[in-house]
Amino acid sequence: CDLPQTHSLGNRRALILLAQMGRISHFSCLKDRHDFGFPEEEFDGHQFQKAQAISVLHEMIQQTFNLFSTEDSSAAWEQSLLEKFSTELYQQLNDLEACVIQEVGVEETPLMNEDSILAVRKYFQRITLYLTEKKYSPCAWEVVRAEIMRSLSFSTNLQKRLRRKD
């Protein structure tokens, strides 16, 4: 499956929108920094078959979409930017879903992939727990926004590597 060129453009647009969503000075939030344990090894792309990589990417985007679709998220961010961001993510999910269906027919996805998807889910559970503990404060959301920008950048890089493999 070849992800359309519009997919990588959508990726970039999502990152730009996320960057624009910042509301408060980041400098005031240093004390709220937190180690969410991003599962970097799941995004290095070396040990993956393409079907695995695509399903891990899908999980990453799905969880990001879920995180920014909550009521708490709606209260934290400027509505029009949030809607545009969610729309970009939704389009990426559609692209990836089409690929997942196509690729899984081509190669069996080993159980190892379930571990990778679980690692991504646990990562987002840690983010959600952090937000809850911090009572969804503006700084907590700033820290999460920075973290998601970083993890989406990893996703973008993995997608670039997948395209180079084609």
Epitope: F27, L30, A146, E147, M149, R150
Partner: antibody
Framework: EVQLVQSGAEVKKPGESLKISCKGS????????IGWVRQMPGKGLEWMGI????????AYSPSFQGQVTISADKSISTAYLQWSSLKASDTAMYYC??????????????WGQGTLVTVSS | DIQMTQSPSSLSASVGDRVTITCRAS??????LNWYQQKPGKAPKLLIY???SLQSGVPSRFSGSGSGTDFTLTISSLQPEDFATYYC?????????FGQGTKVEIK
């Protein structure tokens, strides 16, 4: 390879202006903040201020507020430190270093080689 | 501003010695503390971040510990290349502040 390359040594007279630079390469420049640190001859490290190149938001140490200006041009991945009127006491080595911002990653993990500024009449 | 106080300001030691440098913050900084090494004429080099995390490429003889206000940098077995000045730095709030430095000299 991540690199921060600073502009060369400067010799200036008191009252003159100066702008030194720090060019980042090998990483996404807007994903990291750039901090500036002063080291006067034979002395320790003093944190001056920081900039987020993504939106040019800046913060200064009270000791340096109003004395220097920090700026950045993200189109050329470069941060700047400038003085409008130098004093002899500004004679020092100035370092830039990158900071991961609100991300959990090593602070100030890469440093420039330093720019020696000498102010003398 | 948060004040950082290092001790000792200098020490003499021999190759193979275990060396300990302490850093005290004027208020709690949780684990937001970094340690740097600086050699004459060179830029500082990050050794330890978040109080105890070893920076990539730094030898395992360096270790950091502590939280709150009291922190320690330990060199388990001093090597010739370790003779330098060491600085702690708080990273919890702006302005970031450094300790005054500890110079490790050859005995």
């Amino acid at each position: 390879e991540v690199q921060l390359v600073q502009s060369g040594a400067e010799v200036k007279k008191p009252g003159e202006s100066l702008k030194i630079s720090c060019k980042g390469s090998g990483y996404s420049f807007t994903s990291y903040w750039i901090g500036w640190v002063r080291q006067m001859p034979g002395k320790g490290l003093e944190w001056m201020g920081i900039i987020d190149p993504s939106d040019s938001d800046t913060a200064y140490s009270p000791s340096f507020q109003g004395q220097v200006t920090i700026s950045a041009d993200k189109s050329i991945s470069t941060a700047y430190l400038q003085w409008s009127s130098l004093k002899a006491s500004d004679t020092a080595m100035y370092y830039c270093a990158r900071h991961p911002g609100l991300n959990w990653a090593p602070d100030f993990d890469y440093w420039g080689q330093g720019t020696l500024v000498t102010v003398s009449s | 501003d948060i004040q950082m106080t290092q001790s000792p300001s200098s020490l003499s030691a021999s190759v193979g010695d275990r060396v300990t440098i302490t850093c005290r913050a004027s208020q709690s900084i949780n684990r937001f503390l970094n340690w740097y090494q600086q050699k004459p004429g060179k830029a500082p080099k990050l050794l330890i971040y978040a109080a105890s995390s070893l920076q990539s490429g730094v030898p395992s003889r360096f270790s950091g510990s502590g939280s709150g206000t009291d922190f320690t940098l330990t060199i388990s077995s001093l090597q010739p290349e370790d003779f330098a000045t060491y600085y702690c730095q708080q990273a919890i709030d702006l302005p970031f502040t450094f300790g005054q430095g500890t110079k490790v000299e050859i005995k």
